[in-house]
């Protein structure tokens, strides 16, 4: 995207400040909150987006637990620490020196502790289940048409490699989209499933992160698919470590 055009903007992230000060007068965009330069040809990492969002906080996300190892984002929004690549740092702390460990999508996966808490590595969320309920329609969507459109959406709007959309399940009115991406599968330049899920979640809530006025327009054979609730389940490569007290 070049500054020679009237609109020096970031198509994939509206939470940026852009100016024509890149190499050769190119449009360069920096994330709000962190000032980190972002690549506007792909999705911005969720960590940088959350950091930007803290300047105008909205309702926190709520996640539900599908099994013993799934995580619930009970903590809502926080101002995260991101590494130079924009990923969540494994250990997050607040201003009162309370610390906890997070996974690659920034959800807490340990009890809270103090500054002595160690988080040895950023544990990867390798399986995401997006559970949707769509608004009533004249009839059920054709499953194969729905599958094709949702795969197309993740492939083309969110730029996720097709192999990472593992399955699309449908039992009217519930749609489930399974995203799977192991550490070994993710190549340089691949969109992270966590970032794709976050963009999708914001889209279906009418809070699109993309530049422009359009928002998500999802249709199956011309019929609008309107989502009335979204639940996202995260499963990590290593199960979370919570004390028994929390689980009772």
């Amino acid at each position: 995207h070049t500054a020679a055009q009237d609109n020096c903007t970031c198509p994939t992230n509206k939470m940026t400040v852009c100016s024509p000060d890149g190499p050769g007068g190119r449009c360069q965009c920096r994330a709000l909150g962190s000032g980190v330069a972002v690549d506007c040809s792909t999705l911005t990492s969720e960590c940088l987006l959350l950091k930007a969002r803290m300047s105008a906080p909205k309702n926190a996300r709520t996640l539900v637990r599908p099994n013993e190892h799934a995580l619930v984002d009970n903590d809502g929004l926080y101002d995260p620490d991101c590494d130079p690549e924009g990923r969540f740092k494994a250990r997050q702390c607040n201003q009162t020196s309370v610390c906890w460990c997070v996974n690659s999508v920034g959800v807490r996966r340990t009890d809270k502790g103090d500054l002595s808490l160690r988080c040895d590595e950023l544990v990867r969320t390798h399986h995401i289940l997006i559970d949707l309920r769509h608004r009533p329609t004249a009839g059920a969507f054709n499953h194969s048409d729905l599958d094709a459109e949702l795969r197309r959406l993740f492939r083309e709007r969110y730029r996720l490699h097709p192999k990472f959309v593992a399955a699309v399940h449908y039992e009217q009115p519930t749609i489930q989209i399974e995203l799977r991406q192991n550490t070994s599968q993710k190549a340089a330049g691949d969109v992270d499933i966590g970032d794709a899920a976050y963009y999708f979640e914001r889209d279906v809530k009418g809070e699109s992160l993309f530049q422009g006025r359009g928002g998500l327009d999802l249709r199956v054979r011309g019929e609008p698919l309107q989502v009335e609730r979204t639940l996202i389940y995260y499963l990590d490569e290593i199960p979370p470590k919570f004390s028994m007290k929390r689980l009772t």
Partner: antibody, heavy 121, light 107 residues
Framework: QVQLVESGGGVVQPGRSLRVSCAAS????????MHWVRQAPGKGLEWVAV????????DYVDSVKGRFTISRDNSKNTLYLQMNSLRGEDTAVYYC??????????????WGQGTLVTVSS | DIQMTQSPSSLSASVGDRVTITCRAS??????LAWYQQKPGKVPKLLIY???TLQSGVPSRFSGSGSGTDFTLTISSLQPEDVATYYC?????????FGGGTKVEIK
């Protein structure tokens, strides 16, 4: 069926202007990024411009920046390319092509039949 | 801007031969590469997107591979109807540059 039909090509003198159009049918036009691609006689394909599904973003190849403008009217299912200050090297068949779903950047799965623009005095 | 270099620029092979065309990006483009076929006097046709995904309706003798900077289009068994010029194209971001093309002929 899914179809793109270009129109508006013709012979034009250097320095003059021309607008070509592309009428879309058979799909939800407003949900797709759209592109113009051109092919000079006997030459390869050259991408010219993109406009996102909602008109929020445009991009151009360097050689046409400041001279060509891509636009769309989603209510009319029509894509446009306004070409000003035309040069001899703009002589080509101009194709419109469908790009990404709710996006601009993707491969082109639907192409029009093309319209020939000849810039000559 | 990222340059796309295709090789060879032309080739001649016999019916039934395995044909390989390569495309190299001057910088990494992940899997954002497409292959098109353009028969003489016809409109280009999408064969492969996302480097290796076959477009619906395209014969399975066509396949694509690669990621990052090096990509390959393979025709496993060349058929007379495959005579055409083949183009690669990057679509990670603008400009969506095409390669110079590879003209495939039958011996």
């Amino acid at each position: 069926q899914v179809q793109l039909v270009e129109s508006g090509g013709g012979v034009v003198q250097p320095g003059r202007s021309l607008r070509v159009s592309c009428a879309a049918s058979g799909f939800i036009f407003s949900t797709y990024g759209m592109h113009w691609v051109r092919q000079a006689p006997g030459k390869g394909l050259e991408w010219v411009a993109v406009i996102w599904y909602d008109g929020s973003n445009e991009d151009y190849v360097d050689s046409v920046k400041g001279r060509f403008t891509i636009s769309r009217d989603n209510s009319k299912n029509t894509l446009y390319l306004q070409m000003n200050s035309l040069r001899g090297e703009d002589t080509a068949v101009y194709y419109c092509a469908r790009g990404g779903y709710n996006s601009g950047w993707w491969a082109f799965d639907v192409w029009g039949q093309g319209t020939l623009v000849t810039v000559s005095s | 801007d990222i340059q796309m270099t295709q090789s060879p620029s032309s080739l001649s092979a016999s019916v039934g031969d395995r044909v390989t065309i390569t495309c190299r990006a001057s910088q990494g483009i992940s899997h954002f590469l497409a292959w098109y076929q353009q028969k003489p006097g016809k409109v280009p046709k999408l064969l492969i997107y996302a480097a290796s995904t076959l477009q619906s309706g395209v014969p399975s003798r066509f396949s694509g591979s690669g990621s990052g900077t090096d990509f390959t289009l393979t025709i496993s068994s060349l058929q007379p109807e495959d005579v055409a010029t083949y183009y690669c194209q990057k679509f990670n971001s603008a400009p969506l540059t095409f390669g110079g093309g590879t003209k495939v002929e039958i011996k």
